[in-house]
Amino acid sequence: GQGTPSLVPHEEAAAPGRTTATPAGASLEWSQARGLLFSPAPQPRRLLPGPQENSVQSSACGRQHLEPTGTIDMRGPGQADCAVAIGRPLGEVVTLRVLESSLNCSAGDMLLLWGRLTWRKMCRKLLDMTFSSKTNTLVVRQRCGRPGGGVLLRYGSQLAPETFYRECDMQLFGPWGEIVSPSLSPATSNAGGCRLFINVAPHARIAIHALATNMGAGTEGANASYILIRDTHSLRTTAFHGQQVLYWESESSQAEMEFSEGFLKAQASLRGQYWTLQSWVPEMQDPQSWKGKEGT
């Protein structure tokens, strides 16, 4: 079943920098922003790097990598728990190759990979192993109890063999940004609704504060007008019906908003912001109790 909507009185959140949500396949029009937005366009225009992309960092841990290829050195970061995020445009998949590994599997060391269709734990036979994500984002988390231990990774990206996405789907990266729901256009197929994916740095959580208007009265059937927000890690899903101010917080660094077909047909609108919050629980928690919430 779906969760109970989280609602707060309408109060202005600290205004984050803006990222305008652009549909997949549309031309990119950038607003002045710190956040980053990708579409499947072959060469998306880039903004200046935000704080999560700073090329000079003392540790690999906590970074969000948005370049097409890169090397991630998670050896000896000085912390037992280290996570990095990799993000690419919709329509691409992330490939990961383990160049070096000194994880001690019998001591409980491990590599955890997760994304929209991936929840993988691995340790044995890692060297030279190549892993391909099923979608355009991947969080890599390393648990290593021995100082100086860890993995050296090379990541790349390539076009997905099949498209998991719809024309009107959108992707937002970066620590904060503007959320604008897609609008129904005759040229775009909106069958099944449209989705907005938000990915932030791996140890952050996402807060969403937005106003939904013109939602219409339809709450059931094919023309039901609603917004679903789903935490990609815990799979906790919250449904929002009707005109309202909505506030939602994730438990992890990845969220998925779904605007129903009825929402689009009603020419409903959602406008607001997302920003990051400090994580109160490391994603995937301790590997021995890597549970998450099973129900949705």
Partner: antibody, heavy 122, light 107 residues
């Protein structure tokens, strides 16, 4: 090559118990979630239960909740289903299925065994 | 619990035909839908995951589409080995549920 071999099925009276086993080979067993899916004779498929790689999370279909218990022994590359208080409607071919992911809530089944038949009848 | 329905429940077709099977969920499941093929006396086989992604080793004549509540499995040119039953299954939320199946037999 991934192989899943179920055993432990048979004829049992209503109210009695049975324990199914699934022996896995050809993959790193403790990296993956596992599931039991059943199919009544001439009927469709029904998910019964799932267990994550480290037994940290477990789920059951409403129809078996409180009666069936899923477990795994990673050292033995084995999956189990303890079935208590069996009913006639539990009669089915029980398949052991591998998940492509480590958490059972992934809910996909990329490799299946050939099944073991459980018949509940007096 | 999420209900899955399939249509048609059975169909007769000839080798070379284009075959379409539809699956509907009782509420939106985004793209969290899988398709399986099952031949008599055999275990099911995963064909499509995430509504449209082809499982490794599955012939490209199989394709999946749809999102939200309505999904389609298409076999572009039916081959003799494709005569079987086909099931959709949602992996959006527990308990995971299957459609009742569609049997494809020879015309």
């Amino acid at each position: 090559e991934v192989q899943l071999l179920e055993s432990g099925g048979g004829l049992v009276q209503p109210g009695r118990s049975l324990r199914l086993s699934c022996a896995a080979s050809g993959f790193i067993f403790d990296d993956y979630a596992m599931h039991w899916v059943r199919q009544a004779p001439g009927k469709g498929l029904e998910w019964v239960s799932g267990i994550s790689w480290n037994s940290g999370s477990i789920g059951y279909a409403d129809s078996v909740k409180g009666r069936f218990t899923i477990s795994r022994d990673n050292a033995k590359n084995s999956l189990y289903l303890q079935m208590n208080s069996l009913r006639a409607e539990d009669t089915a071919l029980y398949y052991c299925a591998k998940d492509p992911n480590s958490l059972y809530r992934s809910g996909s089944f990329d490799y299946w065994g050939q099944g073991t038949l459980v018949t509940v009848s007096s | 619990e999420l209900q899955m329905t399939q249509s048609p429940s059975s169909l007769s077709a000839s080798v070379g035909d284009r075959v379409t099977i539809t699956c509907r969920a009782s509420q939106s499941i985004s793209s969290y839908l899988n398709w399986y093929q099952q031949k008599p006396g055999k275990a099911p086989k995963l064909l499509i995951y995430a509504a449209s992604s082809l499982e490794s080793g599955v012939p490209s004549r199989f394709s999946g589409s749809g999102s939200g509540t309505d999904f389609t499995l298409t076999i572009s040119s039916l081959q003799p080995e494709d005569f079987a039953s086909y099931y959709c299954q949602q992996s959006y939320s527990t308990p995971f549920t299957f459609g009742p199946g569609t049997k494809v037999d020879i015309k």
